[in-house]
């Protein structure tokens, strides 16, 4: 058993049929010694008496809010949550496996630049009685600070018969050095509580590996005289790290016909312009990637040829 926060405790249980469970000793937070009784949750039924109460915790019916009283007055509370371990593996019932980039990916994180700011998100089908708490650091043995905000519900989607809820959190490394080579990874830890079930999820990464630039901005077409060619120009996204001479991007320019079956013409360039042939009803799209490190491409920025 360990304390998650004040008056909230997590009991770690090996979860198998007829498991003996854990014996947990609760102590009433009071100078009183006599006449103390205990109740569980909303029940008025007395569970036991004494300044300390030993309980056998082996299933969710044994978790909940234990309250000690004296003469009708509440003295203190202890909320017990369960963390299940089945066949040596901690349960992952609360979050959905996103399976990207690999199986057992529950947390996904992205950064728009090298400033030390990043966003993580996760998915669940649970809509109520759900809380999240996020902590992060760079390194784990001598951790350097990363500050995370509160997790918020960022999207709702219908997937077949189920509703899916996306939560996200923004974090910022306290003393980020954008140009420095990373040697220690960022660690992100999410505590998830659904009713009386506790679970924790972790992710470890280097900022350089989760970079995904915003799409190029101000995408414009300039027709070239007496030609089907156009000059496409764009700018670095505002969110990208500066100076651009150091934090450089490379770009992919694509001409795509109206039909998905039509052949795509692609051009790669380090410049912020390119000359392409603009076909009727086609569109021109541009996306960006870090020039020197193959992390994710941005989403496309697009304009119609017409």
């Amino acid at each position: 058993i360990w304390e998650l926060k004040k008056d909230v405790y997590v009991v770690e249980l090996d979860w198998y049929p007829d498991a003996p469970g854990e014996m947990v000793v609760l102590t009433c937070d009071t100078p009183e010694e006599d006449g103390i009784t205990w109740t569980l949750d909303q029940s008025s039924e007395v569970l036991g008496s004494g300044k300390t109460l030993t309980i056998q915790v082996k299933e969710f019916g044994d978790a909940g809010q234990y309250t000690c009283h004296k003469g009708g007055e509440v003295l203190s509370h202890s909320l017990l949550l369960l963390h299940k371990k089945e066949d040596g593996i901690w349960s992952t019932d609360i979050l959905k496996d996103q399976k990207e980039p690999k199986n057992k990916t529950f947390l996904r994180c992205e950064a728009k630049n090298y400033s030390g700011r990043f966003t993580c998100w996760w998915l669940t089908t649970i809509s109520t009685d759900l809380t999240f708490s996020v902590k992060s650091s760079r390194g784990s043995s001598d951790p350097q600070g990363v500050t995370c905000g509160a997790a918020t519900l960022s999207a709702e989607r219908v997937r077949g018969d189920n509703k899916e809820y996306e939560y996200s959190v923004e974090c910022q490394e306290d003393s980020a050095c954008p140009a420095a080579e990373e040697s220690l990874p960022i660690e992100v830890m999410v505590d998830a509580v659904h009713k009386l079930k506790y679970e924790n999820y972790t992710s470890s990464f280097f900022i350089r590996d989760i970079i995904k630039p915003d799409p190029p901005k101000n995408l414009q077409l300039k027709p070239l005289k007496n030609s089907r060619q156009v000059e496409v120009s764009w700018e670095y996204p505002d969110t990208w790290s500066t100076p651009h001479s150091y934090f450089s991007l490379t770009f992919c320019v694509q001409v795509q016909g109206k039909s998905k079956r039509e052949k795509k013409d692609r051009v790669f360039t380090d410049k912020t312009s390119a000359t392409v042939i603009c076909r009727k009803n086609a569109s021109i799209s541009v996306r960006a990637q870090d020039r020197y490190y193959s992390s994710s491409w941005s989403e496309w920025a697009s304009v119609p040829c017409s």
Epitope: E45, L47, I55, K58, E59, D62
Partner: nanobody
Framework: EVQLVESGGGLVQPGGSLRLSCAAS????????MYWLRQAPGKGLEWVST???????AYAEFVKGRFTISRDNAKNTLYLQMNNLKPEDTALYYC????????RGQGTQVTVSS
């Protein structure tokens, strides 16, 4: 009519073990929290242990891992396995349907003495 009948008490040496049983009838046993209480000579009624409907137990401080409460809903029976008994465990042990012992049996005597 609610009936609770305890058995299994007796004379035992310090460090010995006993298993108390309580046969319940006249109510839906599986729907109630059940209790073991005790009364030492010249003392008031003292709570020993509780078992919830879900089967999880709670114990008084003096028990310190020596006793185990259990229930068999199919047999309408409550149990208290008592190990490493001490002279101070000498008392009349009652099975009860409430913490105050307003609905309880006649009790079974446990004497721990060398």
């Amino acid at each position: 009519e609610v009936q609770l009948v305890e058995s299994g008490g007796g004379l035992v040496q310090p460090g010995g073990s006993l298993r108390l049983s309580c046969a319940a009838s006249g109510f839906t046993f599986s729907g109630y929290w059940m209790y073991w209480l005790r009364q030492a000579p010249g003392k008031g009624l003292e709570w020993v242990s509780t078992i919830k409907t879900t089967g999880g137990g709670a114990y008084a401080e003096f028990v310190k891992g020596r006793f185990t409460i259990s229930r068999d809903n199919a047999k309408n029976t409550l149990y208290l396995q008592m190990n490493n008994l001490k002279p101070e465990d000498t008392a009349l042990y009652y099975c009860a349907r409430d913490f105050e012992g307003t609905v309880r049996g006649q009790g079974t005597q446990v004497t721990v003495s060398s």
